[in-house]
Amino acid sequence: TPEVWVQVQMEATELSSFTVHCGFLGPGSISLVTVSWGGPDGAGGTKLAVLHPELGTRQWAPARQARWETQSSISLALEDSGASSPFANTTFCCKFASFPEGSWESCGSLPPSSDPGLSAPPTPVPILRAD
């Protein structure tokens, strides 16, 4: 069964910077990746980035840069411009559309006790689903 992993990490050098890392474990080719925050895509989440393996990548504030790290994993850098840190308690979800498997989504957040540079474990939360 395909699986999506999500890691959320605070940058050690800049406490206002976060990076979301997501990956797809499974056969098939990825046709699109969507990163949302505040909940899953289509279920209250707001899209922060859309990445297509060949057409390009797009991101919207507070996301700074979306990029492919490998053929099956992506990263999204976020810049927290506010005085408080809304990212700390936020859920980030990554949805991978792949052929022929369909869509798979998983969510993660920064662990409450995170030290800079530490990341959430790459374990999918129960929002893993196939469309």
Partner: antibody, heavy 114, light 113 residues
Amino acid sequence: EVQLQQSGPEVVKPGASVKISCKASGNTFTDYFINWVKQRHGKSLEWIGDVNPDNGGTNYNQKFKGKATLTVDKSSGTAFMGLRSLTSEDSAVYYCATLFFDSWGQGTTLTVSS
Amino acid sequence: DIVMTQSPSSLNVSAGEKVTMSCKSSQSLLNSGNQKNYLAWYQQKPGQPPKLLIYGASTRESGVPDRFTGSGSGTDFTLTISSVQAEDLALYYCQNAHSSPYTFGGGTKLEIK
């Protein structure tokens, strides 16, 4: 497949503002992420910016900041582009296109003339 | 901004001929992570909006005839039409799909003798 239907031609006076629309129909999950592109007569294409329907987030080409304002009404699947302080340089065909430019509207011709 | 330079600016060929047009970018369009080039080609016929032909430098959009072939990597790209048809009369644009602003080339005008 996404279909994009743009509003009709506009003739406006210098200094005025205008708002053109782009209605999307079809149903894939990146339908309503919309780009706007300018094409002056006999010239190449210029990307103006894009808009995210989830939160109204925008990305602009620096060249068009202050000139164009991009908005979207997610409920109707309609994107809008406002253009202000119009001059003859703004006379062009304006296109909307889907997120990765794989579907385009038919274009809206804007003529700025006194 | 990434500058896209196309050549030649116009081509005048007979039906059945092979045509090659060039597009050069001022910065690499190769994504090192997935080894994909974010370069697209568009065809614009008179009075019509542009139509996506090729993306990822070499992948044909669905429904595009196989006489259209895209190639290249990094900063140098080519669009080839193996046997030009009368309906290929159009302007052809390349586009940087790598980074904002998503700049277009000046275009190559294809005319049929």
